[in-house]
Interface confidence: low
């Protein structure tokens, strides 16, 4: 794992505990809540980053804003269950036998019911599209520049490979981000976009999950780019399954 | 100012290899697919592949797959064409050009000024 | 392999004129198509992409539609400048292909 040697911190999770007892006296890394031993020269996964926030205190919390479009994270936080890689496992339940599916971002994708509920598989979410209002600006940006900003923002900043941001749309003051990756397309060590599009969130609302870097300082040809709202659409490859309750 | 430059065109012999280059200028080159295209005199446009700059990865036209190999030097912002085993159908003019990732920005937005090349004994 | 027929394969107008050019894919493309003019001795030049979307410095005399097989892209108002070959492209699926061309001559 690549964590910082001199002093034994995460650079990607601060949500980390970490010391120098790996292998040859190594730094080592584990992620609160789960106790999981993270990589820290990539991103940590989502699941594992809510059960940490969830460790943490409470006034830490915020809500996702909820949409009505497509597939959004209506719920907000709750403290997930991990499979042993740190995916969400398909099946989620709270303290009181509540249960749920939900896909490999963690967002429920059935209506919830109890115990005796089953959910087969971890269904991937393969595209995600990030909404965002920037507030106003003397002018509207350059679409060119503020795509070539955005793609080296997620190549640089979350590594994420820059075939997954599959397009950049403008329409002032409105930016929305593609981020597309099907099963067969991610490779061993590709970030997930799922795990990508979770930091830029946080990025965006000031509460990012890197190590002693500064926040998001994000400009288009020097031109702040300043974010007053987010919303984010989840796309299945298999769609969900809610009753015709919900869709009224 | 966004630049996409080909060489190496001229006469080349039946059975034998082209070999051009696109030099790109003024642009981030990983952040786009680099693609070559061709055009046979008086004839329409034809994909011959694409190398992603940032892992190599290329995808090409199944008409040429087994003779063409599309190199890139990303410390230099260029990318080369071999296509081997050459005859006079694919004497051409031969672009390159780029396009963005993800299927949405297949489209070629900038393209070179083109290199010809004459296959002929 | 997504082959595209273009319409028709040689037109001629007079300035001022609208004019049509008709593009059909031979299996769903979406709206993942593009449109470039050629003009004799110079490279293509994109005017159009995801069908409708006018390209950065493109006059809007030049517009897209279409989803699905069946796309045009239209010239409002001929200019005698316009004269060039016209090519569609589909960016849906590889390998990318083209249209054979639409010769566009003024009268």
């Known amino acids: 794992h690549t964590a910082a040697q001199d002093n034994c911190t995460c650079p990607t999770n601060k949500m980390t505990v970490c010391s120098p007892d790996g292998p040859g006296g190594r730094c080592q890394c584990r992620a609160l809540g789960s106790g999981m031993a993270v990589d820290c020269s990539t991103l940590t996964s989502k699941c594992l980053l809510l059960k940490a926030r969830m460790s943490a205190p409470k006034n830490a919390r915020t809500l996702v804003r909820p949409s009505e479009h497509a597939l959004v994270d209506n719920d907000g936080l709750y403290d997930p269950d991990c499979d042993p890689e740190g995916r969400f496992k398909a099946r989620q339940c709270n303290q009181t036998s509540v249960c749920w599916c939900v896909n490999s971002v963690g967002v429920r994708r059935t209506d919830k019911g109890d115990l005796s509920l089953r959910c087969d598989e971890l269904v991937r979410t393969h595209h995600i599209l990030i909404d965002l209002r920037h507030r106003p600006t003397a002018g509207a940006f350059n679409h060119s520049d503020l795509d070539a900003e955005l793609r080296r923002l997620f190549r640089e900043r979350y590594r994420l490979h820059p075939k997954f941001v599959a397009a950049v749309h403008y329409e002032q003051p409105t930016i929305q981000i593609e981020l597309r990756q099907n099963t067969s397309q991610k490779a061993a060590g590709d970030v997930d976009i799922g795990d990508a599009a979770y930091y830029f969130e946080r990025d965006i609302k000031g509460e990012s999950l890197f190590q002693g870097r500064g926040g998001l300082d994000l400009r288009v040809r020097g031109e702040p780019l300043q974010v007053e709202r987010t919303l984010i659409y989840y796309l299945d490859e298999i769609p969900p399954k809610f009753s015709m309750k919900r869709l009224t | 100012e966004v630049q996409l430059l080909e060489s190496g065109g001229g006469l080349v012999q039946p059975g034998g290899s082209l070999r051009l280059s696109c030099a790109a200028s003024?642009?981030?080159?990983?952040?786009?697919?680099m693609n070559w295209v061709r055009q046979a005199p008086g004839k329409g446009l034809e994909w011959i592949g694409r190398?992603?700059?940032?892992?190599?990865?290329?995808h090409y036209n199944q008409k040429f797959k087994d003779r063409v190999t599309i190199s890139v030097d990303k410390s230099k912002n260029q990318f080369s064409l071999k296509l081997s085993s050459v005859t006079a159908a694919d004497t051409a003019v031969y672009y390159c050009?780029?396009?963005?990732?993800?299927?949405?920005?297949?489209?070629?937005?900038?393209w070179g000024q083109g290199t010809t090349v004459t296959v002929s004994s | 392999e997504t082959t595209l027929t273009q319409s028709p394969a040689f037109m001629s107008a007079t300035p001022g004129d609208k004019v049509n050019i008709s593009c059909k894919a031979s299996?769903?493309?979406?709206?993942?198509v593009a449109w470039y003019l050629q003009k004799p001795g110079q490279s293509p030049q994109l005017l159009i992409y995801?069908?409708?979307y006018r390209y950065t410095g493109v006059p809007d005399r030049f517009s897209g539609s279409g989803s699905g097989t069946d796309f045009t892209l239209t010239i409002s108002s001929l200019q005698a400048e316009d004269v060039a070959v016209y090519y569609c492209?589909?960016?849906?699926?590889?390998?990318?292909?083209f249209g054979q061309g639409t010769r566009l001559e003024i009268k």
């Open positions: 190398i992603d700059p940032n892992d190599s990865e290329t």
């Open positions: 050009a780029r396009s963005g990732f993800g299927s949405t920005y297949w489209f070629f937005d900038v």
């Open positions: 492209q589909q960016h849906y699926s590889t390998p990318l292909t």
């Open positions: 299996q769903d493309v979406s709206t993942a």
């Open positions: 003024g642009f981030t080159f990983s952040n786009y697919w």
């Open positions: 995801s069908a409708s």
